[in-house]
């Protein structure tokens, strides 16, 4: 009997640190998103980046989903938000349009039960960037705790898409689960 | 037999405890690094900074290793990685090399096995730093979540490091493990 | 007995599992914290803030406690700290008092038991808001990991808090739990 | 690609300008580096430059060697009151992304002869 | 100041050769490796103290960090015969010479 009560007691608790394993990573989506160079829009007015890699480089995704642009929340909960975006402009690339620039970024939640769009975090500067100088660059980064809900979704808008900086290290988002919904 | 498996469960039970709040610490390694004051370079080159604190007023480390410059991963896993990086000039120092500046910082990743260096975050700004100010000031901070592997190697690299603030709230990096790798 | 023991066990495990559960939320507190705009000081000196918002919009508080513009630590932890400061002028506020301007924050500890203050993050910049643009922007993001005790206060100071943008979206601070002292 | 020139026989206490001319790069976040090295010697840095950073130079070149951008595609080495001692063949370099230790554009090098 | 050693070394067709190079202070991992054959421009081979430069061979290695650092030339064939250099690239406070005095390579 005893020996008996020991082995169930072992398997049991061999399932529970499967079953505290498996919790522990479940309850942890993040996602680390950068910016895909090849579909940078144009112009100067806010637009919303809708193509980011999820999956090359330092890019990666795991229990959230990427879809047309959004970064959609699959498990509820609370979660460190976060994006760096960089701009950059080179003499080389022609004159720019104006030299004083808006050069800003704003993380917005979209809910499908309710269409609407709410900023959660807005960065930037005014730059003034003259002639004077054959380079400029600036850099943006926010971050914030926030609930979110299964379906949410996560985006980014920025002004002036044209000089944002393809590389991996340079425009990026993302998110990670810190914590339950009490 | 009762009072028996009672007192053996309530003794695994303990030991389960013990081993969960070991592992759960042991899971999460941290390190908060402020820069070392007596050793910042001068010059405006690009450049691997070396010298930082690991044990004094708000810099500490917990199961990851910081030598010659360069935060050791000790430990597998999804990290959070932050830098906030200051730079000043004030008129008392002397005059600039130029007015024109990219101050800049990259927060890379090296692995001993394959000798290579990679940029997981940058950011910056391009600043024209005038004689008509006395003092000048510019902070950069940058974050974000990556997978980091036993053996791997994060250091901070930045341009203009002569002008560096050496205060350990103005000029610091760290990490934090989040979860571990599935 | 054996069916005893069992329905002991599932019990046993049950609170166990109440335990975990609770335990990891309560070891978790956390505070996302927005300003006031309703109390912003005039002027351009640094100051403290002590108007934030913990109840509505993304504003938030969970074992945590905020009190005369302070948010007080409950429970022995390390922390991630962060801030964002978004200062803003539009010429139809009428002209600034100089257009060469210091924008700055510092997230400070206050500790009761030694009344002393100290500065865990700066960052900020020198601008120079020149008459020709209508309109100026510029934020600022910090954040940190931090040991913190309980009874410990973290405080915000900024320098021209006349300039402060008073959306929910631009300027807040926060902290969360990520682990246990040793 | 880099290239020195104005490498000359000169008398001591001349002044001579030597001018390093780049192409497929700029100085917006490359750096131009000068070295020497003496017949039969090792290599000498004597300084760099680029545009976000300004110059910077070896102690003992300080006074009398000025290091200066003088176009979008040329940096001149500016020396005075030079000496026997500054008999050497002068090459210019780039220092990729500005990091000093990668110097990885070399040109072939113009001799400078200081002789009375 | 960096100190190179030894002044000169020779080694066989096959066989392996190590320079070392020594930092007065630390100068973390900003070290820099160029091999210079007589009546050329110096060659990039290591940079970062053990990142190889594109297009070099990985029969070189560079290794260490904060003031000791070695360079490893293994298999070592004829065309290896040259000087090799060290820098740094850290500081340009009270620099003499940014790079040491150089070790000569003689393949037998």
């Known amino acids: 009997g005893s020996q008996h009560i020991r082995a169930e007691k072992a398997m049991v608790d061999g399932s529970w640190l499967d079953l505290a394993k498996r919790s522990k990573l479940e309850a942890q989506p993040f996602a680390h998103l950068t910016i895909n160079a090849t579909d940078i829009p144009s112009g100067s007015h806010k637009v919303s980046l809708s193509s980011w890699y999820h999956d090359r480089g330092w890019a990666k995704i795991s229990n959230m989903t990427f879809s047309n642009g959004k970064l959609i929340v699959n498990q509820d909960g609370f979660y460190y938000l976060y994006a760096n975006i960089c701009f950059r402009h080179h003499e080389t690339s022609g004159d720019l349009a104006t030299e004083y620039l808006q050069l800003m970024v704003y993380v917005t939640k979209t809910s499908i039960k309710i269409p609407s769009s709410h900023t959660l975090m807005k960065g930037g500067s005014t730059k003034y960037w003259s002639g004077n100088s054959e380079f400029h660059f600036y850099s943006i980064n926010v971050g914030g705790f926030f609930k979110l809900r299964s379906g949410e979704e996560i985006s980014i808008e920025v002004s002036n898409p044209s000089l944002l900086d393809p590389d991996q290290d340079a425009t990026y988002f993302g998110a990670f689960k810190v914590r339950d919904i009490d | 037999g009762s009072q028996h498996i009672r007192a053996e469960k309530a003794m695994v039970d303990g030991s389960w405890l013990d081993l969960a709040k070991r592992s759960k610490l042991e899971a999460q390694p941290f390190a908060h690094l402020t820069i070392n004051a007596t050793d910042i370079p001068s010059g405006s080159h690009k450049v691997s900074l070396s010298s930082w604190y690991h044990d004094r007023g708000w810099a500490k480390i917990s199961n990851m290793t910081f030598s010659n410059g360069k935060l050791i991963v000790n430990q597998d896993g999804f990290y959070y990685l932050y830098a906030n990086i200051c730079f000043r000039h004030h008129e008392t120092s002397g005059d600039l090399a130029t007015e024109y500046l990219q101050l800049m910082v990259y927060v890379t990743k090296t692995s001993i096995k394959i000798p290579s260096s990679h940029t997981l975050m940058k950011g910056g700004s391009t600043k024209y730093w005038s004689g008509n100010s006395e003092f000048h000031f510019y902070s950069i901070n940058v974050g974000g979540f990556f997978k980091l592997r036993s053996g791997e190697e994060i250091s901070i690299e930045v341009s203009n490091p002569s002008l560096l603030d050496p205060d350990q709230d103005a000029t610091y990096f760290g990490a934090f493990k989040v979860r571990d790798i599935d | 007995g054996s069916q005893h023991i069992r329905a002991e066990k599932a019990m046993v495990d049950g609170s166990w599992l109440d335990l975990a559960k609770r335990s990891k939320l309560e070891a978790q507190p956390f505070a996302h914290l927005t300003i006031n705009a309703t109390d912003i000081p005039s002027g351009s000196h640094k100051v403290s803030l002590s108007s934030w918002y913990h109840d509505r919009g993304w504003a938030k508080i969970s074992n945590m406690t905020f009190s005369n513009g302070k948010l007080i630590v409950n429970q022995d932890g390390f922390y991630y700290l962060y801030a964002n400061i978004c200062f803003r002028h539009h010429e139809t506020s009428g002209d600034l008092a100089t257009e060469y301007l210091q924008l700055m924050v510092y997230v400070t500890k206050t500790s009761i038991k030694i009344p002393s203050s100290h500065t865990l993050m700066k960052g900020g910049s020198t601008k120079y808001w020149s008459g020709n643009s209508e309109f100026h922007f510029y934020s600022i993001n910090v954040g940190g990991f931090f040991k913190l005790r309980s009874g410990e206060e973290i405080s915000i100071e900024v320098s021209n808090p006349s300039l402060l943008d008073p959306d929910q979206d631009a300027t807040y601070f926060g902290a969360f739990k990520v682990r246990d002292i040793d | 690609s880099v290239e020195e020139s104005g490498g000359r026989l000169v008398t001591p206490g001349t002044p001579l300008t030597l001018t390093c001319t780049f192409s497929g790069f700029s100085l917006s976040n490359n750096a131009i580096n000068w070295v020497r090295q003496a017949p039969g010697k090792g290599l000498e840095w004597i300084g760099y430059?680029?545009?976000?950073?300004?110059t910077y130079c070896a102690s003992w070149a300080k006074g009398r060697f000025t290091i200066s951008k003088t176009s979008s595609t040329t940096v001149d080495l500016k020396m005075t009151s030079l000496t026997t001692e500054d008999t050497a063949t002068y090459f210019c370099?780039?220092?990729?992304?500005?990091?000093?230790?990668?110097?990885?554009?070399w040109g072939q090098g113009t001799l400078v002869t200081v002789s009375s | 100041v960096m100190t190179q050693t030894p002044a000169s070394v020779s080694g066989p067709v096959g066989g392996t050769v190590t320079i070392k190079c020594q930092a007065s202070q630390s100068i973390g991992s900003n070290l820099g490796w160029y091999q210079q054959k007589p009546g050329q421009p110096p060659k990039l081979l290591i940079f970062?103290?053990?990142n190889l430069e594109s297009g070099v061979p990985s029969r070189f290695k560079g290794s260490g960090s904060g003031t000791q650092f070695t360079l490893t030339i293994s298999d070592l064939e004829c065309d290896d015969a040259a000087t090799y250099y060290c820098q740094q690239g850290y500081t340009t406070n009270n620099v003499l010479n940014a790079f040491a005095g150089g070790t000569e390579v003689v393949v037998k």
């Open positions: 970062s103290a053990s």
């Open positions: 430059t680029w545009s976000g950073g300004g």
């Open positions: 370099a780039r220092a990729y992304d500005s990091e000093w230790d990668r110097l990885d554009l």
